[in-house]
Interface confidence: low
């Protein structure tokens, strides 16, 4: 069947539409288009004859129509008047007529809408606002958006006038939003620019900050007032009902108790004509004096003196607090507080008690701290240390020794060589030394405040020939798989190479062997019994070399699991039983025996003469190494059979 399809069906003004013919018969004479729902010569648009391929305009032809060989009709530059029905009249080859009608609708391209308002400054909870979407357009749908969202459901929102007008009843500050309207028709949709609703509101009850109402005398009072308001509120301050100033902040420096009272902030909105006030009560407390610390001993001597620190001034009904090193007082038997906490006594001061110490006075609002106090504890001198630690020097080098002893006040130093005073300096320097400079070098440290002196003596040897070294050990009896041993080659000498041998061989490569301290120290980690060998150290320089006597490492080990011999377990009655127990151990272990769990003798050998079947049972050997603290044991079963009944062995 012949049909007409309009593409598109809804056409925008100025655009074009194609009336597309479907199921056109094959053999045609011609066809003609008419405006309307029927064939009417007065409303013919165009006719077309196939044979002549001639198109003839009709009375309704506007010059905007184009006819195609397939009978489709294109109408360009569409106007509103083009809306409606179009009829195709087809004359077939057999001159039989056929008709089909199609239609389309024309809509204008919508202009960008705008929003008009009946009230640009509505007052909260009082006014209504009516937004109207302009212009009024026929066949258009009106939509509204608030903050780019569709309208919320609210009894205060009402659409009217075909949704063209949006009314907000009893506006609130929350209605301050971006409003947009949109117009739609089948061919276009346009959205307006946003309109921001400026709702006048407030002032709300003002808030005064900060919230604290208690102050100390001498502080600055700085109160700030804020009230939600549009336009911004104008502020006034009243103290005890008396007007002060018209500012948002009230500042009173260096307040006194007389500034206590009621402080009122008044907020005024000139547009809404409303006033709101908030009152806060401020209390000013008298300022207590700043505390300070007095001491009964400003220069106490370590381990001799006690010090009493007192928090001044004395104030009745006051809480005193103490801090040491910015921490509350530690629990210590050497720290004592008086009943009122005002006096802190340090018994037998040490150099670690220097502080700082602070005391505090607590009042209604806060704690006032004293300035910190530091104790000058006199101590020392401790035993001086002489550096460097070398004891052997070659002739011709410079000898430079430095002495230091912990001391307060700093120690005064003196040097003696072989008991003869040399100089009163912390450092001793002798250039180009010879063998004659060998001797006993003594550093004496003296504390003038405490009157104490301490000395350290060091033997210095000056020799071209290296001395015979010796080996010192930090552990003479290490335990296997537990201890480490550090061998040190003595003496320490300048410009000297240190070497090591084990059982006459150079050191084996082993993760358990480590050289340090310029190869002067050999450390054996996790010693084993195999480390019980002869260790020799050697020293050499450009002119001489020397080796120490060997030192054999005495490794304590064991006891290992003992062995009972002979291995036999079957015996004939009447034989002698002679069991010997042995366990690898250093030192030799202590042995003991148990037969069937009953303790016997503490010997390495167990002897029983002329055994009988009564001697059947379990024989246990127990070994114990008192040096390693370790124990071990083994159990053996012995069977004794009557003579001639068992092929056992006789002892």
């Amino acid at each position: 069947k012949l049909t007409i399809e309009s593409t598109p069906f809804n056409v925008a003004e100025g655009k074009e539409v194609l009336l597309l013919v479907h199921n056109l018969p094959q053999h045609l004479f011609g066809y003609s288009w008419y405006k309307g729902e029927r064939v009417d010569g007065n409303r013919q648009i165009i006719g077309y004859v196939i044979g002549t391929q001639q198109a003839t305009p009709g009375p309704a032809y506007s010059g905007r129509e184009i006819i195609y060989p397939n009978a489709s009709l294109l109408i360009q530059n569409i106007i509103q008047n083009d809306t409606g029905f179009y009829t195709l009249h087809v004359i077939k080859s057999d001159l039989v007529n056929e008709e089909a009608t199609g239609q389309f609708r024309v809509y204008p391209e919508l202009p960008k809408p705008s929003i008009s308002s009946n009230n640009s400054k509505p007052v909260e909870d009082k006014d209504a606002v009516a937004f109207t979407c302009e212009p009024e357009t026929q066949d258009a749908t009106y939509l509204w958006w608030v903050n780019n969202q569709s309208l919320p459901v609210s009894p205060r929102l009402q659409l009217s006038n075909g949704n063209r007008t949006l009314t907000l009843f009893n506006v609130t500050r929350n209605d301050t939003a971006s409003y947009k309207c949109e117009t739609q028709n089948p061919v276009s949709a346009r959205r307006s620019d946003s309109v921001i609703l400026n709702v006048l509101y407030g002032p709300d009850a003002p808030t005064i900050s900060p919230l604290n109402t208690s102050y100390r005398s001498g502080e600055n009072l700085n109160l700030s007032c804020h009230a939600a308001s549009n336009p911004p509120a104008q502020y006034s301050w009243f103290v005890n009902g008396t007007f002060q100033q018209s500012t948002q902040e009230l500042f009173i420096p260096n307040i006194t108790v007389n500034n206590s009272g009621s402080y009122t902030c008044q907020a005024h909105n000139s547009d809404t004509g409303l006033n709101r006030t908030t009152v806060t009560t401020i209390t000013v407390y008298a300022e207590p004096p700043k505390p300070f610390i007095t001491s009964n001993n400003s220069n106490p001597v370590e381990d001799e003196d006690a010090v009493a620190l007192t928090c001044e001034p004395e104030i009745q009904n006051t809480t005193y607090l103490w801090w040491v090193n910015n921490q509350s007082l530690p629990v210590s038997p050497r720290l004592q507080l008086s009943n009122d906490n005002r006096t802190l006594t340090l018994l037998s001061v040490t150099r670690n008690d220097v502080g700082p110490y602070e005391c505090g006075i607590q009042n209604e609002l806060s704690v006032d701290h004293s300035d910190p106090v530091i104790l000058n504890v006199l101590y020392g001198p401790d035993d001086p240390t002489i550096s460097p630690s070398y004891t052997y020097y070659r002739p011709g080098v410079n000898l430079s020794l430095s002495c230091h002893a912990a001391s307060n006040p700093p120690a005064q130093y003196s040097w003696l060589i072989d008991g003869n005073i040399q100089q009163h300096t912390q450092e001793l320097f002798i250039s180009n030394i010879t063998e004659k400079n060998s001797g006993l070098y003594t550093c004496q440290a003296n504390n003038s405040a405490s009157g104490h002196s301490r000395t350290t003596v060091k033997t210095i040897t000056v020799s071209a020939e290296l001395p015979k070294p010796s080996i010192s050990s930090n552990n003479s009896k290490p335990v296997e798989d537990k201890d480490a041993v550090a061998f040190t080659c003595e003496p320490e000498a300048q410009n000297t190479t240190y070497l090591w041998w084990v059982n006459g061989q150079s050191l084996p490569v082993s993760p358990r062997l480590q050289l340090s301290n310029g190869n002067r120290t050999l450390t054996l980690f996790n010693v084993t019994r195999n480390d019980a060998r002869a260790y020799v150290c050697g020293i050499q320089n450009s002119v001489s070399a020397n080796r120490s006597d060997p030192v054999t490492l005495d490794v304590l080990y064991g006891p290992d699991t003992p062995i009972i011999s002979p291995p036999d377990s079957s015996y004939l009655s009447g034989a002698n039983l002679n069991l010997s127990c042995h366990s690898a151990s250093n030192p030799s272990p202590q042995y003991s025996w148990r037969i069937n769990g009953i303790p016997q003798q503490h010997t390495q050998v167990l002897f029983i003469a002329k055994i009988t079947p009564n001697n059947n049972g379990t024989y246990a050997c127990f070994v114990s190494n008192l040096a390693t603290g370790r124990n071990n044991s083994i159990v053996k079963s012995i069977t004794v059979s009557a003579s001639g009944t068992s092929p056992g062995l006789s002892a």
Epitope: S209, P231, E249
Partner: antibody, heavy 121, light 106 residues
Framework: EVQLLESGGGLVQPGGSLRLSCAAS????????MGWVRRAPGKGLEWVSS????????SYADSVKGRFTISRDNSKNTLYLQMNSLRAEDTAVYYC??????????????WGQGTLVTVSS | DIQMTQSPSSLSASVGDRVTITCRAS??????LNWYQEKPGKAPKLLIY???SLQSGVPSRFSGSGSGTDFTLTISSLQPEDFATYYC????????FGQGTKLEIK
Amino acid sequence: EVQLLESGGGLVQPGGSLRLSCAASGFTFSSSYMGWVRRAPGKGLEWVSSIGSGSYSTSYADSVKGRFTISRDNSKNTLYLQMNSLRAEDTAVYYCARYPSVPFSPHLDYWGQGTLVTVSS
Amino acid sequence: DIQMTQSPSSLSASVGDRVTITCRASQSISSYLNWYQEKPGKAPKLLIYAASSLQSGVPSRFSGSGSGTDFTLTISSLQPEDFATYYCQQAGNPHTFGQGTKLEIK
């Protein structure tokens, strides 16, 4: 005589930080609101930030919010502007200025001579 | 934020002329508007605050008017020292400035 003296400006790389100071004298600093205003080369004045007399109330332009911090030390009569994450568009002469305590209309009655901040790599 | 628009952006006039500069706010700011004068190499100077209040020490030939969204700065008789850039500033929050009007010698 009211005097405001800015310091701390200079050349800094993008992303860097700078702290401007403004030493005030000749008026009761502790009771005055203070502010910072800047002028970029070839541009107009731009308000940057303001602070209440007791540091309770601070306000910032959107262009510097989250990067700049205004503060004051009333004991030293000094206003500060800590500028972090600096950008090339922060290049400007920065003025320190005073808001007097006149009811209902904030305005800047005294200005410093300004300090130049240049943000460039 | 409130936007401030000044017009004209530049203006040529002669000594003795009467000059008017306008400033428009994007929303009502009541009478919270200030005017400043800035000369090259110098700090800005306050002329008018609260739309119409003359700052102490400023010559009376400067005057301000307006409220809501439209404001005017008038110089009744231009003097040689008046050639400068003029800025309006709204005193709501934040305290934004207009883009400036450059007053030049004709």
